[in-house]
């Protein structure tokens, strides 16, 4: 028979999305046991029928990768989990409406920091996503967010930071002291979607000035 409260078997059904990798996760409820099995279905907002996710039927793990199934940036999606206990009790819970554009979080960018004598160069590499374009290429975050920019900061000492920002991929902090260590942080920002990545950090030392030796 169905339990009085579905949360006895199943809790916190939600999408966790990072750089457009969309993972459905959930927790077992207080009456869940290790042999409780879970089956996952998904649907596009506006569609009537649910689709069973292959590879996520009668599983015991508490996550399911729905990246491919929820890969259309312009669509909204739902997913639901049905838990069935060893004793035959079942419960179903559905996610809130999911938009990958709105809900995905941004990972730190991939950056190369290059030391020079009186400057530090930072080259940001475009961040790939699992989403494929019509030509088969993987889209980058830059392909998806028109307003994406990079915010770069160089900690010079405890009280002074230098800042750069832009939509370019190559930056250089000039006027630095040779043979000195600096901490750089680089973030991806998308103001129109209120997104800000965790920072990439690089600790770099300017090269010694050999011209006086």
């Amino acid at each position: 028979h169905a339990p009085e409260d579905p949360s006895d078997l199943l809790q916190h059904v939600k999408f966790q999305s990072s750089n457009f990798e969309n993972i459905l996760t959930w927790d077992s409820g207080p009456e869940g046991t290790p042999d409780t099995v879970y089956s996952i279905e998904y649907k596009t907002y506006g569609e009537r029928d649910w689709v069973a996710k292959k590879g996520c039927q009668r599983i015991t793990r508490k996550s399911c990768n729905l990246t491919v199934e929820t890969g259309n940036l312009t669509e909204l999606y739902y997913a639901r989990v049905t838990a069935v206990s060893a004793g035959g009790r079942s419960a179903t819970k559905m996610t809130d409406r999911f938009s990958s554009l709105q809900h995905t979080t941004l990972k730190p960018p991939d950056v190369t920091c290059i030391s020079k004598v009186r400057s530090i160069q930072m080259i940001v590499h475009p961040t790939p996503t699992p989403i494929r374009a019509g030509d088969g290429h993987r889209l980058t975050l830059e392909d998806i967010f028109h307003d994406l920019f990079y915010h770069l900061e160089l900690q010079v000492n405890r009280t002074y930071q230098m800042h750069l920002g832009g939509k370019q991929r190559e930056y250089e902090f000039f006027g630095l002291t040779p043979d000195t260590e600096f901490l750089g942080t680089i973030m991806i920002c998308v103001p129109t979607w209120a997104k800000e990545s965790a920072p990439y950090m690089c600790r770099v030392k300017t090269l010694p000035d050999r011209t006086w030796t």
Epitope: L139, G165, G166, K167
Partner: antibody, heavy 117, light 107 residues
Framework: EVQLVESGGGLVQPGGSLRLSCAAS????????MYWVRQAPGKGLEFVSV????????HYVESVKGRFTISTDNAKNTLFLQMNSLKSEDTAVYYC??????????WGQGTQVTVSS | DIVMTQSPSSLSASLGDRVTITCQAT??????LSWYQQKPGQTPKLLVY???RLQTGVPSRFSGTGSGTKFTLTISGVEAEDLASYFC?????????FGQGTKVELK
């Protein structure tokens, strides 16, 4: 050398349609943000629409939403602007432009669109 | 939408004059502000980006300053070839918006 060449402008009656084209060369067209910008006679500049040629993601200024459609043919390195339900206030020179290395620094020479009865 | 208010709409300058044009945004745009020059019958030419960074090949008499909501373009000594219209552009968020322009004429 980056080159952008617009075509397709002309005189059209209110309510009519036009399709503008922009032939691009000298850069990687298939992974870029491409823009249509217009300038009404004696007036300022206005961004009309933008498309990412790889993802197909588009944005429009509010005044043309539902009437204009931006698109590309990546095989032919060509940007389009389909303009329907044209109004007299759409009269302008229409430029295509592109963002390269983060900067909007390359523009075509423009094509004149005149909406008049 | 972010509205860019540019002033003055026109100005008369003598050759060698120092000219300042200002642009104000209705919300903070950090340093995502570019300045373009446009001559009659020509396409806009990028002069300054990132509020203060001079585009390659642009003479050093042009300079830009500002961040947040207030920005200025300065021509330290106007030359004949600088007589043109100047537009600011916010590149922070779509729709990208220009100021209404400043026409620099000879006094």
């Amino acid at each position: 050398e980056v080159q952008l060449v617009e075509s397709g402008g002309g005189l059209v009656q209110p309510g009519g349609s036009l399709r503008l084209s922009c032939a691009a060369s000298g850069f990687t067209f298939s992974s870029s943000w491409m823009y249509w910008v217009r300038q009404a006679p004696g007036k300022g500049l206005e961004f009309v629409s933008v498309i990412n040629t790889r993802s197909g993601i588009t944005h429009y200024v509010e005044s043309v939403k539902g009437r204009f459609t931006i698109s590309t043919d990546n095989a032919k390195n060509t940007l389009f602007l389909q303009m329907n339900s044209l109004k007299s206030e759409d009269t302008a020179v229409y430029y295509c432009a592109t963002r390269i290395q983060g900067l909007i620094d390359y523009w075509g020479q423009g094509t004149q669109v005149t909406v008049s009865s | 939408d972010i509205v860019m208010t540019q002033s003055p709409s026109s100005l008369s300058a003598s050759l060698g004059d120092r000219v300042t044009i200002t642009c104000q945004a209705t919300q903070s745009i950090s340093t995502f502000l570019s300045w373009y020059q446009q001559k009659p019958g020509q396409t806009p030419k990028l002069l300054v980006y990132g509020a203060s960074r001079l585009q390659t090949g642009v003479p050093s008499r042009f300079s830009g300053t500002g961040s947040g909501t207030k920005f200025t373009l300065t021509i330290s000594g106007v030359e004949a070839e600088d007589l043109a219209s100047y537009f600011c552009l916010q590149d922070y968020s779509w729709p990208l918006t220009f100021g209404q322009g400043t026409k620099v004429e000879l006094k």
